[in-house]
């Protein structure tokens, strides 16, 4: 009596289907209206249907749930809590669904949830307890292994009166629930800085994507604890130079690959250590593509081709000799 078709094909639930069985409670494994379901593939797709809420009649078998391209606006506490629970749900994609608020405990009662994608949602209000589910100082560990939060920054006029970076980091660190997180993507979020404590509390990270942000410096960021880190994406930021401490930390990570393309490197005397390091290290991918942006006389010079004589700083004149 399930409308789900056999094999791996998808069955669509036509809008009239729900009314056809409307006198009875929903069948446990029926396909929600405006969704496509494949029991064989354990997959439900409710994609680009302008849904305004998470369907309450999701089939218990669902392992992969796509709710992309909708108009959900808000994920309340227990948005996916069902009786019986969605015990198999492992991958949840909510990207591009116009979410502006994710509340505490939104992903509670999903014991198998390993991958979560909230990308391309203007998250003006991300609860500190969105992922941990409780405000305890140490929460039950989240099963999440992969958290994709690319382009979740809301428009300027919709931001709360607080640091967006701080809001996101608070959610990542609450209750130390994400200790098992291996992949974290935070690309395209206009981050100006990376709070210094965030990486130290995510010791299992293998992949960290911070590309296409506005990071100017990594001076206060420590990578020392990330001994499992395999890839660090820092392309398309506003980095001017990497200082000795950062270089040493990156060099000390056994499996690391670092991506540094398209940053406005300032090729003055402060760049000497980084150039020396680049010439020796194997950790930077595509290091031959890195070029100077400033000063003007150095624009487009390849970092690897520079020598110490090229990297000078204009002397700082005493105030009495400075001209207006």
């Amino acid at each position: 009596s399930s409308p789900t078709s056999s094999a791996s094909s998808f069955s669509s639930s036509a809008p009239f289907l729900a009314s056809a069985v409307s006198a009875q409670p929903p069948l446990p494994d029926q396909c929600p209206a405006l969704c496509e379901c494949s029991e064989a593939a354990r997959t439900v797709k409710c994609v680009n249907r302008n849904l305004t809420e998470v369907p309450t009649d999701l089939p218990a078998y669902v392992r992969n749930l796509f709710l992309t391209g909708n108009q959900l606006a808000v994920l309340p506490a227990g948005a996916f809590a069902r009786r019986p629970p969605l015990a198999e749900l492992a991958a949840l994609n909510l990207s591009g669904s116009r979410l502006d608020e994710v509340r505490a405990g939104a992903f509670e009662h999903l014991p198998s949830l390993r991958q979560l994608d909230l990308s391309h949602n203007p998250l003006a209000d991300l609860s500190p307890f969105a992922f941990s589910g409780s405000n305890a100082s140490v929460s039950a560990p989240s099963p999440l292994v992969e958290l994709i939060l690319n382009h979740i920054v809301p428009p300027e006029d919709e931001r709360q009166n607080r640091s967006f970076e701080g809001m996101v980091v608070a959610a990542l660190l609450a209750g130390r629930a994400l200790q098992g997180l291996r992949r974290l993507e935070l690309a395209s979020n206009h981050f100006l800085y990376l709070p210094r404590d965030v990486l130290a509390q995510l010791p299992s990270l293998r992949h960290l994507d911070l590309s296409n942000n506005s990071l100017v410096s990594l001076t206060y960021v420590s990578f020392r604890n990330l001994t499992h880190l395999e890839s660090l994406h820092l392309e398309d930021n506003a980095l001017k130079v990497l200082h000795n401490g950062t270089l040493a930390e990156l060099q000390g990570l056994p499996h690391i690959r670092v991506f540094l393309d398209n940053n406005p490197w300032v090729c003055d005397c402060h760049m000497a250590d980084m150039v020396t390091w680049l010439k020796e290290t194997e950790v930077v991918q595509g290091k031959d593509r890195l070029t100077c942006a400033y000063p003007e006389k150095m624009r487009n010079r390849v970092l690897l081709e520079l020598n110490s004589a090229d990297l000078d700083c204009d002397p700082i004149l005493p105030p009495s000799l400075q001209t207006s």
């Epitope: 729900a18 929903p26 209206a33 809420e53 998470v54 369907p55 808000v74």
Partner: antibody, heavy 121, light 107 residues
């Protein structure tokens, strides 16, 4: 005229069943979520149940969960409430009320006149 | 569940009076607070939604304010047709809940 009209109320014994209907007219019924709200004699308002426009999102108050079933037929512009295992405390006027695009952040901007359900032996 | 507490439960006032009814939520509900008016034997009628937005056709003497947990409905100059019972209701989370009501009577 934009309106909601409830029917199906009446006297029923405890443990009995009743099915309420709400007929909508004057607006595009299939575009709106709908709710049932009740009011016991001389008491305040109590939200009972919610159903979204395509029937894939349904919520109930704890007091009726497992006993009441909300449903709708967009082709007939009708909302229903199947009430089973009725109790004395279910005695109330039952209103159907139009909601917004989701249960949260919404409001009831159109109400029916209500239908009285009396549960008594 | 979020409890909604209205005060006072009843009040007596005269035509022309300024009347204020308060509604307190047991936890924050942001701005998702609605106000209804109900007259005896009639269905409720939406006055204000999302704290302060006046429903179409509702007189401008009605206004709403507040945020978080504390909200207020104000009738700037009470008219004879305003004697009724007023309910607040939160739409922040399910179950949706109403306040106990405030009965506005003629003094």
């Amino acid at each position: 005229e934009v309106q909601l009209v409830e029917s199906g109320g009446g006297l029923v014994q405890p443990g009995g069943s009743l099915r309420l209907s709400c007929a909508a007219s004057g607006f595009t019924f299939s575009s709106y979520s709908m709710n049932w709200v009740r009011q016991a004699p001389g008491k305040g308002l109590e939200w009972v149940s919610y159903i979204n426009s395509v029937s894939n999102t349904i919520y109930y108050a704890d007091s009726v969960k497992g006993r009441f079933t909300i449903s709708r037929d967009n082709a007939k512009n009708s909302l229903y409430l199947q009430m089973n295992s009725l109790r004395d405390e279910d005695t109330a006027v039952y209103y159907c009320a139009r909601g917004g695009v989701r249960v949260l952040r919404s409001y009831f901007d159109l109400w029916g006149r209500g239908t009285l359900v009396t549960v008594s032996s | 569940d979020i409890q909604m507490t209205q005060s006072p439960s009843s009040l007596s006032a005269s035509v022309g009076d300024r009347v204020t009814i308060t509604c307190r939520a047991s936890q924050t509900i942001s701005s998702y607070l609605n106000w209804f008016q109900q007259k005896p034997g009639k269905a409720p009628n939406l006055l204000i939604y999302t704290t302060s937005i006046l429903q179409s056709g509702v007189p401008s003497r009605f206004s709403g304010s507040g945020s978080g947990t504390d909200f207020t409905l104000t009738i700037s100059s009470l008219q004879p047709e305003d004697f009724a019972t007023y309910y607040c209701q939160q739409s922040y989370s399910t179950p949706l809940t109403f306040g106990g009501g405030t009965k506005v009577e003629i003094k």
